[in-house]
Interface confidence: low
């Protein structure tokens, strides 16, 4: 037999064992020119001393072989004795170590068996009714194909699937979508209607994330508020990376899970923008306001479940003086200003009503006044902080008020609203004999004492009604009792108590008359 021809004799070996795990496989035969044909195959196992024979059976029942030696590719012409216009069955028998191994056969019409290309270029992936839809441009001059896919997960081997016949300029495939694991897909094509024709090579991997991106398992920590009124949010634990199939490890596009940080500033609701989304790698600085922070995981199919953390307000600011002056026209607040053209957000809320919405006012961008102060004023009619109760006031500042992460805390303090002078007056003042020349004066705590830092001191005044002499005794804001000494028996005294703030002198309580009885000796 000539080497260029298919030899119609018995091959020079005994038999073939098709039950072996090793041996020839993936035989593929197709036309490569008007009269030229090629068959190629893979050989699994040690290749030393292996001889390959391409076997061919014609529709007449006659069979022949090509001896290819150690080569796993053979080219032959339409003059080699193999019918190219009629159906033939081809397979490979590989002889080694006194045994013969056989490939699965292919049955085809060689002339019609054109080498089809796999899907090339961009394979678009989308979700359709809980399934995966892949779509791609049909390779040039190859309309009319049968398409298969294979897919695997990180823990499974390849599984084969069918996309069905395709007959258009674009081809598509519906594939299974896994809920919780990433998948690698590959596609291959062959000519439509030629059952035995060769499949194309497999396409490049298409990496597909799970339908549900993984729940982000992260942990945060937040630093204390610095002198600049800002604190840093830091990530203590990175989200775990998704396990990927073999062909999707490395820079495989399409399977990535991106994590984003969604920041929602709960304080100061009147500002322009309350929410900001930023990449998880870019951890922001925050003001001392209260925030909700969500970590959102998303993949090519959209966002997945998120986890939300609450970051409480940090009220431990540097001691900054807030002056509040109440005049006939209204009330004005003064505080040390920040830079030129700063917008301030003034927020207040009655103490004990933290669950309710705070009142909030945004100033126009303002420059410091000549004394270096910033101001905010409101009229009496507005009713702002008009009730006689304790308010928590926080002032935030930003040169870029629309940028959520550029706000800082200027101060956080308490203020007693309404007519604090009258409302703060101590009640239930009582006098008890203490000794022959002293008394104990007690009173109920001022309403101002419910407001942290507002009550500066109590002042107790004692007047000798005989001589009109007056003495005043300062008392710590935490005390509600004082002892008055060096009093004279039989003299009438009046005692009053007032509660002072840093900026306001309180109103005296109702005068309380008392005297120490003269002791009569026997």
């Amino acid at each position: 037999c000539r080497t260029s021809e298919c030899c119609f004799q018995d091959p020079p070996y005994s038999d073939a064992d098709s039950g072996s795990a090793s041996g020839p496989r993936d035989l593929s035969c197709y036309r490569i020119s008007s009269a030229g044909y090629e068959c190629s195959w893979q050989y699994e196992g040690p290749t030393a001393g292996v001889s390959h024979f391409l076997r061919c059976c014609l529709s007449s029942g006659r069979c022949c072989y090509f001896a290819t030696g150690s080569a796993t590719r053979l080219q032959f012409s339409d003059q080699a004795g193999v019918s190219v216009l009629h159906t033939v069955t081809l397979w490979v028998e590989s002889w080694a170590r006194n045994r013969t191994e056989k490939s699965p056969e292919v049955t085809l019409q060689l002339y019609k068996s054109v080498k089809y290309k796999p899907p090339l270029g961009d394979i678009k992936v989308s979700k359709l009714a809980g399934q995966l839809r892949m779509e791609w441009e049909t390779p040039d001059n190859q309309v009319g194909a049968e398409v298969q896919f294979r897919h695997r997960t990180p823990s499974s081997s390849w599984k084969l699937g069918d996309c069905g016949p395709q007959d258009d300029d674009t081809e598509s495939c519906l594939c299974p979508l896994e809920m919780n694991v990433a998948q690698e897909f590959q596609l291959r094509r062959r000519r439509l209607g030629s059952q035995g024709s060769s499949w194309s090579k497999w396409s490049s991997p298409v990496c597909v994330p799970p339908e549900n991106p993984p729940q982000p398992q992260v942990r945060f920590s937040v630093e204390q508020l610095g002198r600049d009124g800002r604190r840093r949010l830091t990530l203590k634990e990175q989200p775990t990376q998704l396990e990927l199939p073999e062909g999707c490890q490395g820079p495989a596009p399409g399977v990535e899970v991106t994590y984003q940080l969604q920041l929602h500033m709960l304080s100061c609701p009147c500002k322009a923008k309350a929410t900001r989304t930023l990449p998880l790698e870019k951890m922001p600085y925050l003001s001392g306001a209260a925030y909700n922070v969500a970590v959102i995981s998303s993949n090519r199919f959209g966002p997945g479940p998120n986890q939300t953390w609450h970051i409480p307000a940090d009220t431990h600011t540097e001691p900054v003086a807030l002056n509040i002056s109440v005049g006939t026209n209204g009330t004005t607040m003064y505080w040390p200003a920040r830079a030129q053209s700063t917008t301030y957000c003034i927020e207040w809320q009655p103490v004990g009503q933290e669950g309710s919405l705070a009142t909030c006012n945004l100033t126009a961008p303002q420059d410091p006044d000549p004394a270096g102060m910033a101001t905010y004023s409101w009229s009496r009619e507005s009713g702002a902080m008009g009730q006689e109760k304790c308010y928590h006031i926080t002032i935030f500042a930003s040169a870029h008020p629309k940028k959520l992460t550029l706000w800082s805390t200027v101060l956080s303090t308490y203020h007693f609203g309404g007519n604090a002078s009258a409302a703060g007056t101590p009640h239930h003042v009582s006098v008890k004999n203490h000794s022959l020349d002293s008394v104990s004066v007690d009173w109920a705590p001022s309403l101002l004492s419910t407001c942290p830092g507002v009550l500066k001191e109590y002042v107790v005044r004692c007047r000798d009604e005989d001589s009109n002499q007056v003495s005043e005794h300062p008392v710590q804001p935490t005390e509600t009792q004082v002892t008055l000494s060096d009093l004279r028996a039989g003299v009438a005294y009046t005692v009053q108590v007032r509660a002072d703030t840093a900026w306001l002198r309180g109103a005296w309580s109702q005068p309380q008359r008392f005297s120490i009885k003269v002791q009569v000796s026997d």
Epitope: S18, S59, G61, W91, T107
Partner: nanobody, 127 residues
């Protein structure tokens, strides 16, 4: 995809005869060596008989020699198993199988060697 369809099974008295047929479609029949196997529930499939592509060489399991005959008709794409002198121990599901390769060999007694299988036909022999 090659398809194999068996027929001819049934209920038969001991000593009787049956002829099983197996037709191949969607493939070139003459490219295949053909085999018959049988399986009793709960047991492995066992080789019964085989025939080469040309039909010139045949092979049988010892218990079938002299009683069973395998033949093929390449024009009709069909292989046959003529079973005479049936015994109750011949009761089983009979399967037809096809494989490309050089035949015969003890290799082909191994069910794993075969690529294509029919769905099976029941043969019951009563005493």
């Amino acid at each position: 995809q090659v398809q194999l369809v068996e027929s001819g099974g049934g209920l038969m008295q001991a000593g009787g005869s049956l002829r099983l047929s197996c037709a191949l479609s969607r493939g070139i029949f003459s490219a295949y060596a053909m085999g018959w196997f049988r399986q009793v529930q709960g047991k492995e499939r066992e080789f019964v008989s085989g025939i080469s592509r040309s039909g010139s060489t045949t092979d049988y399991v010892d218990t079938a020699k002299g009683r069973f005959t395998i033949s093929r008709d390449n024009a009709r794409d069909t292989v046959y198993l003529q079973m005479n002198s049936l015994k109750p121990e011949d009761t089983a599901v009979y399967y037809c199988a096809a494989v490309t390769g050089t035949f015969p060999s003890s290799t082909y007694h191994n069910a794993n060697a075969y690529h294509h299988w029919g769905q099976g036909t029941q043969v019951t022999v009563s005493s």
